[in-house]
């Protein structure tokens, strides 16, 4: 039976959520964000082999055409399926403000 | 001035909508789809250089971390921002049916 969550390439090689520890300098945010000064950035990294976490019909098509025409059509790509919100304290003209960003930290991943 | 739609790699090299002509056999659909027998598949193909069609804050972060840690963090990836619906005539146990698929043909593209 097909298992869309079993990685045929070996544990941890396929599309999944990774955490990367980053400073404001790493993110290019040092000039406008005050806090947090360190961020646990969650992002989607890994290969998208056939039938693994396919997001939709388009991903299936893309994989089939990639097999046929690998030089023309790339394999599906590991991207966020949803996001976790994150609060930043940022500089403003008049002081500081809290802003919630809804599209910053990946929550889970799929192949498109 | 930054232009999120100007490709620094040269015309047609960056993330954009491509059309790939495919048969039902190419798509692996020959056993369940009756029509159309040929599909103009629209998909997102191309590179995602810095600031090009960035979908959101996550894409910006990913690019900055890719620059810092290219072996760990991949560059953003060219994926559909939205889809066009497509109607397929497909085989059923009792005959045929028309089915609309909303996630089959890419309509426009961005980098995530």
């Amino acid at each position: 039976a097909r298992n869309g969550d079993r990685c045929p390439l070996g544990p941890g090689r396929c599309c999944r959520l990774h955490t990367v520890h980053a400073s404001l300098e790493d993110l290019g945010w040092a000039d406008w964000v005050l806090s947090p000064r360190e961020v646990q950035v969650t992002m989607c990294i890994g290969a998208c082999p056939s039938q693994f976490r396919e997001a939709n019909m388009h991903a299936q098509i893309k994989m089939n055409l990639h097999r046929l025409k690998p030089d023309t059509v790339p394999a599906p790509c590991c991207v966020p399926a949803s996001y976790n919100p994150m609060v930043l304290i940022q500089k403003t003209d008049t002081g500081v403000s809290l802003q919630t960003y809804d599209d910053l930290l990946a929550k889970d991943c799929h192949c498109v | 001035a930054r232009n999120g739609d100007r490709c620094p790699l040269g015309p047609g090299r960056c993330c954009r909508l491509h059309t790939v002509h495919a048969s039902l056999e190419d798509l692996g659909w020959a056993d369940w789809v009756l029509s159309p027998r040929e599909v103009q598949v629209t998909m997102c193909i191309g590179a995602c250089p810095s600031q090009f069609r960035e979908a959101n804050m996550h894409a910006q972060i990913k690019m900055n971390l890719h620059r810092l840690k290219p072996d760990t963090v991949p560059a953003p990836c060219c994926v559909p921002a939205s889809y066009n619906p497509m109607v397929l005539i497909q085989k059923t146990d009792t005959g045929v049916s028309l089915q609309t698929y909303d996630d089959l043909l890419a309509k426009d593209c961005h980098c995530v």
Epitope: T19, H21, L34, S35, P36, Q40, P85, V87, I89, K107 | -
Partner: antibody, heavy 119, light 112 residues
């Protein structure tokens, strides 16, 4: 309305361990850090350590290193603080607090859990 | 560890009168971005602490404007312009420039 709901009071023997829970209800859990702060009777506040639930990465005050373990379960939006080798001076109210990394801004606190260590 | 020293230990106040609490740190709390990583908290009798001021001088959401924070480097002050009966409790400063986070010993504000 987001709340941090802590587990109930505990009475423990010296040398034993205690595990206190802190559940975030009604809001996002993963994108904040959870810190643990204790307050002995009639005393001030003392930061013990904290965790980034999104990654499970914890940090501890040197004073508690080796004796405290802070964990988080994203699926249940719950953070835990386990303190081992308890002694009478660990008798305190233990608070969890939500913050932005370790930059402070503890804008939300649990109501506290009283842990009494007595033989 | 950074040592935080508050004074006075106890502060009897008259409603309607101003009050001032001092907090000194053993190391500078001024970060390279020009902001001081110092918070002020109030613990009312029988309650959990509540955030009053963050980043040295910024009032938290819902905090009355009679509360203000000032100072830089190692010397900080919390002022209440006109004390009200509901302001009684223990006030703590906390440094967040580095781990471990450390609190001042507290200042007990009570009505005369």
């Amino acid at each position: 309305q987001v709340q941090l709901v802590q587990s109930g009071a505990e009475v423990k023997k010296p040398g034993s361990s205690v595990k206190v829970s802190c559940k975030a209800s009604g809001g996002t859990f993963s994108s904040y850090y959870i810190s643990w702060v204790r307050q002995a009777p009639g005393q001030g506040l003392e930061w013990m350590g904290g965790i980034a639930p999104i990654s499970g990465t914890a940090s501890y005050a040197q004073k508690f290193q080796g004796r405290v373990t802070i964990t988080a379960d994203e699926s249940t939006s719950t953070a835990y603080m386990e303190l081992s080798s308890l002694r009478s001076e660990d008798t305190a109210v233990y608070y969890c607090a939500r913050g932005l990394a370790y930059d402070g801004y503890f804008d939300l606190w649990g109501r506290g859990t009283l842990v009494t260590v007595s033989s | 560890d950074i040592v935080m020293t508050q004074s006075p230990l106890s502060l009897p106040v008259t409603p309607g009168e101003p009050a001032s609490i001092s907090c000194r740190s053993s190391q500078s709390l001024l970060y390279s971005n020009g902001y001081n990583y110092l918070d002020w908290y109030l613990q009312k009798p029988g309650q959990s602490p509540q955030l009053l001021i963050y980043l040295g001088s910024n009032r938290a959401s819902g905090v009355p404007d009679r509360f203000s924070g000032s100072g830089s480097g190692t010397d900080f002050t919390l002022k209440i312009s006109r004390v009200e009966a509901e302001d009684v409790g223990v006030y703590y400063c906390m440094q967040a420039i580095g781990v471990p986070l450390t609190f001042g010993g507290g200042t007990k504000v009570e009505i005369k």
